[in-house]
């Protein structure tokens, strides 16, 4: 009777038709399952847990980008239940490889210890891993992260470095 219902459809016994599973709102994720003709009796939507977000629909909640821990970047906008975090410029002691192709994690900051000479974010940095690096005053423009995050919204990111 319902073998042709779609991924997000359940079979409504009252109408004899496939029907859209109730979509969740922003900041929510489905609880239990619904789709391909069946719907759990207690199917519904629940709020995203802390550190996660969802744009709604049938998406599960996904972890916010870990700007500092993974990207080694500052937090421009912290994430909430409805939005991913936005990363800003690199943390002190880290620099951006501007022309490097983006991978699935966007653009990652690299340690100044590995930087070519005269890298602007690293100018004035003393050698040694425990050195105090100056801020990125030479980079007053918006970080590429503010563009990269838009392409990545809805995708999960690793929380560890």
């Amino acid at each position: 009777e319902y073998s042709n219902c779609g991924e997000n459809e359940y079979y409504n016994q009252t109408t004899g038709l496939c029907q859209e599973c109730p979509p969740c709102g922003p900041g929510e994720e489905p609880y239990l399952s619904c789709g391909y003709g069946t719907k759990d009796e207690d199917y519904g939507c629940v709020p995203c847990p802390a550190e996660k977000f969802s744009k709604g629909g049938y998406q599960i909640c996904r972890r916010h980008k870990d700007c500092e821990g993974f990207f080694r970047a500052t937090v421009l906008t912290p994430g909430d239940m409805e939005n991913d975090a936005e990363c800003g410029p690199c943390l002190p002691g880290y620099y951006m490889l501007e022309n490097r192709p983006r991978n699935i994690y966007g653009m990652v900051c690299y340690s100044c210890l590995l930087a070519p000479p005269n890298t602007k974010e690293c100018v004035g940095a003393t050698s040694g891993a425990s050195a105090n690096f100056p801020g990125t005053s030479g980079s007053s423009t918006l970080s590429p992260f503010q563009h990269a995050h838009k392409e990545l919204s809805g995708q999960g990111h690793l929380a560890t470095a």
Partner: antibody
Framework: EVQLQQSGPELVKPGASVKMSCKAS????????MHWVKQSHGKSLEWIGY????????SKNQKFKGKATLTVDKSSTTAYIQLNSLTSEDSAVYYC??????????????WGAGTTVTVSS | DVVMTQTPLSLPVSLGDQASISCRSS???????????LHWYLQQPGQSPKLLIY???NRFSGVPDRFSGSGSGTDFTLKISRVEAEDLGVYFC?????????FGAGTKLELK
């Protein structure tokens, strides 16, 4: 009197899209699902899908999932179907039909007069 | 999808004759709720389809009693006891037990 009034014939070019309307009157628009059915020239009937005017939820025949978009305007009690990337295979008469599902009776009890779509360059 | 096979595809009759149209489905049309969602529609020339019979044997409102439906499982029949001029057209059987709803190819009832 319950009526479904459909928009006039369409002559469209291959690759273009077309949007047809179905104006409902004489009953509670949001109380019944609106279905769309295709009838190719001299052929049988094919179920495209339906929309629930109450909440805009839709379900479509797998065959038409990339082809048809179903919408409604509750304020004007009008249902719409848009067909995109038209080919000669889309030349047909398109009917809207009201769906009755009370007391486990499931059928199309009222049909529009149909809109003829001709795809030709 | 459930395939609905109608026979004959053309049925020449004289007015006053009895007519019989057969419809066979590729799967049983008995729903898990016990109902059998086999319907008959008539499409008169230049018009949209109209419901005649629903759930095998129930005449829709305003349908004359010369129309009757019967059958079960996968085999169904529509009978017209005495054909009148207004009965001419194409008859479609349709199932709504399984998703998606499907229709037969149609039987054209025409004068000899």
């Amino acid at each position: 009197e319950v009526q479904l009034q459909q928009s006039g014939p369409e002559l469209v070019k291959p690759g273009a899209s077309v949007k047809m309307s179905c104006k409902a009157s004489g009953y509670s628009f949001t109380g019944y699902n609106m279905h769309w059915v295709k009838q190719s020239h001299g052929k049988s009937l094919e179920w495209i899908g339906y929309i629930d005017p109450y909440n805009g939820a839709t379900s479509k025949n797998q065959k038409f999932k990339g082809k048809a978009t179903l919408t409604v305007d509750k304020s004007s009690t009008t249902a719409y179907i848009q067909l995109n990337s038209l080919t000669s295979e889309d030349s047909a008469v398109y009917y809207c039909a009201r769906y009755y599902y009370g007391d486990y009776h499931w059928y199309f009890d009222v049909w529009g007069a149909g809109t003829t779509v001709t795809v030709s360059s | 999808d459930v395939v609905m096979t109608q026979t004959p595809l053309s049925l020449p009759v004289s007015l006053g004759d009895q007519a019989s149209i057969s419809c066979r489905s590729s799967q049983s049309l008995v729903h898990s709720n016990g109902n059998t969602y086999l319907h008959w529609y008539l499409q008169q020339p230049g018009q949209s389809p109209k419901l005649l019979i629903y759930k095998v044997s129930n005449r829709f409102s305003g349908v004359p009693d010369r129309f009757s439906g019967s059958g079960s499982g996968t085999d169904f029949t529509l009978k017209i006891s005495r054909v009148e001029a207004e009965d001419l057209g194409v008859y479609f059987c349709s199932q709504h037990t399984h998703v998606p709803p499907t229709f037969g190819a149609g039987t054209k009832l025409e004068l000899k």
